[in-house]
């Protein structure tokens, strides 16, 4: 899991104007909106004697700064003010002491886009690297969240299922996890990267959709996965298949995956039917779907009550009326567009109360 | 010769908000210091605050804060004052004024605009 | 925050003879660099301000050699040496030290 993105080194060890300074850093460094970066710096300045005994103070500044007037973007100096836009974010993480100019950047931001350039202080020694600056581009977070989905989904039968942001840094402020799910649910321990959902499926989750999101607040920049959950009906030897979609939303059954004890063509086509019959019940007896908003420590927290048991009513479309069989798989992680989850029955009937309650849960 | 030419005069309720323009012209002016500096009538000079038009760095006096905002538009050399929540105490000319610097050397605010007259009035 | 403290307050000077404004500073405005970060401005009735010295000595592009200013750390005087009738109007000076950047109240030079 990579802590920090550390781009290849392109190291420019260009002289300044003065040749008894000199720095050396990467002139480029790209970062994903939302995350971050670590960029080694080393800085050479002559000490003389009267200035041996002086605190070695480093700041970085975006090109074009004022010395006396702009604020610098990061500073190992406690009494000094940096600019809000990159207070928190931007860090002089090496020692100056130790030459060390590394500058740290988490929770990227679209503005953090332009030159920098480093300047030491040390007693009366006093001078602005202008040669080489680094360059910081930031761009689109491409990154998406992952789905883990353990075992079998099974009617009436809690599993965890785990959304993981393994590319995201530790150093950044903790993303925010939201899930959004027709099927009950609620929520289990997370972590700085991933949250845990416990959903309980049941039959008339067939073809609804769970979905991921995860909110950057640092950079105010958010991700998302959705997968498809996908009703089958396998008497025995229950199993779980994943199928990655063409983000069309369309479901198929695709040959060589289909599993499982059914002796013959005839049955199949008759669980088939059943199948469908069940979905017809479940699609006439549908009544009006119940939100559930679940808020905790969320900037922006989602109105109703924060908890599962108060939930607030709106009309929501039912799970689409289409049915595939799928066959086996074990524990599966998400990285298509569109999945089809199946939830396996065990010659179980849909429940009189065949509503669909579709929940948002929000963790941070 | 650079110029700094401002805005028009500006007639405003109380808790309004008003905008100020400042656009240089003749040589752009990314490599010097903008100020906001007003003057009420009858009275001296007051500093609101200060933009780099090149790094987008701002500064703002504390009697300001919170109720300036300057920002810079550098494809037109023009930068803007914000002041939100008008009193009729705002009521001032406002200059905008160029501080000229070397590096790190000082070389005072050279050139000024006309001023804007804002009036703030019920 | 620097103060700025100017006397007199008001001067009356008949044209041909010399002037003197004394500006004050809470704090030290010499710079690391060895220079004084101060300033004197004139704003004549109706005008924008203008400057006149910066770093505390040296004269502004265009500003007459009747003008003069001296002075480090926290005493500074701008001197004429001899006032012209369009010398009237009110003399800042201003540290440019640090912010908040701060005026002195102004001294307002009349011909008698």
């Known amino acids: 899991m990579p802590l920090l993105l550390l781009l290849p080194l392109l190291w420019a060890g260009a002289l300044a104007m003065d040749p008894n300074f000199w720095l050396q850093v990467q002139e480029s460094v790209t970062v994903q909106e939302g995350l971050c970066v670590l960029v080694p710096c080393t800085f050479f300045h002559p000490i003389p004697y009267y200035d041996k005994n002086s605190p070695v103070h480093g700041y970085w500044f975006r090109e074009g700064a004022i010395i006396s007037r702009d604020s610098p973007v990061a500073t190992n100096k406690l009494d000094q003010e940096v600019q809000e836009e990159t207070q928190g974010r931007f860090r002089l993480l090496g020692d100056p002491s130790r030459n060390n100019c590394s500058l740290s950047i988490v929770d990227a931001r679209r503005r953090d886009n332009g030159s920098y350039f480093f300047r030491m202080e040390r007693g009366s020694t006093k001078y602005s690297y202008k040669s080489p600056q680094l360059s910081v581009h930031v761009t689109d977070l491409t990154h998406r969240p992952k789905i883990l989905i353990p075992g079998t989904l099974e009617p009436g039968h809690s599993k965890n299922l785990t959304c993981s942001v393994s590319w995201a840094c530790e150093q950044g402020t903790p993303p925010i996890f939201s899930w959004l799910s027709a099927a009950p649910t609620s929520l289990g321990p997370r972590t700085t990267h991933s949250s845990v959902l416990i959903i309980t499926p049941r039959p008339q989750d067939h073809g609804t959709n769970l979905t991921c999101q995860v909110k950057f607040a640092g950079a105010g920049v958010t991700t998302e996965r959705t997968i498809q959950l996908n009703v089958t009906y396998v008497p025995q030897n229950p199993t779980t298949g994943i199928f990655p979609g063409d983000g069309s939303g369309k479901q198929e059954t695709r040959a060589g995956v289909v599993h499982g004890a059914i002796g013959g063509a005839g049955v199949t086509a008759l669980l088939a039917l059943c199948l469908c019959l069940i979905f017809f019940i479940v699609k006439t007896h549908r009544r009006k779907a119940a939100r559930t908003a679940v808020g905790r420590n969320d900037t922006h927290p989602t109105t109703g009550s924060a908890s599962p048991k108060h939930q607030k009513k709106s009309k929501l479309h039912g799970p689409t009326e289409t049915s595939s069989c799928s066959g086996a798989a074990p524990t599966v992680e998400m990285d298509e567009e569109l999945h089809y989850a199946s939830l396996n029955f065990h010659g179980m009937n849909p429940s009189k109360d065949t509503s669909t309650e579709y929940s948002e849960v929000r963790t941070q | 010769q650079v110029q700094l030419v401002q805005s028009g005069a500006e007639v405003k309720k109380p808790g309004a908000s008003v905008k100020v323009s400042c656009k240089a012209s003749?040589?752009?002016?990314?490599?010097?210091?903008i100020s906001w500096v007003r003057q009420a009538p009858g009275q001296g000079l007051e500093w609101m605050g200060w933009?780099?038009?090149?790094?987008?760095?701002?500064k703002y006096a504390q009697k300001f804060q919170g109720r300036v905002t300057m920002t810079r538009d550098t494809s037109t050399s023009t930068v803007y004052m914000e002041l939100s929540s008008l009193r009729s105490e705002d009521t001032a000319v406002y200059y905008c004024?160029?501080?000229?610097?070397?590096?790190?050397?000082?070389?005072?605010?050279?050139?000024w605009g006309k001023g804007t007259t804002v009036t703030v009035s019920s | 925050d620097i103060v700025m403290t100017q006397s007199p307050l008001s001067l009356p000077v008949t044209p041909g003879e010399p002037a003197s404004i004394s500006c004050r500073s809470s704090?030290?405005?010499?710079?690391?660099?060895?220079?004084?970060?101060l300033d004197w401005y004139l704003q004549k009735p109706g005008q924008s301000p203008q400057l006149l010295i910066y770093?505390?000595?040296d004269r502004a592009s265009g500003v007459p050699d009747r003008f003069s200013g001296s002075g480090s750390g926290t005493d500074f005087t701008l001197k004429i040496s001899r006032v012209e009738a369009e010398d009237v109007g009110v003399y800042y000076c201003?540290?440019?030290?640090?912010?908040?950047?701060?005026f002195g109240q102004g001294t307002r030079l009349e011909i008698k």
């Open positions: 004024a160029r501080e000229s610097w070397f590096g790190e050397l000082y070389y005072g605010m050279d050139v």
């Open positions: 003749g040589n752009t002016f990314t490599s010097y210091g």
């Open positions: 933009i780099n038009p090149n790094s987008g760095g701002t």
């Open positions: 704090q030290s405005l010499l710079h690391s660099n060895g220079y004084n970060y």
């Open positions: 770093l505390g000595s």
């Open positions: 201003m540290q440019g030290l640090q912010t908040p950047i701060t």
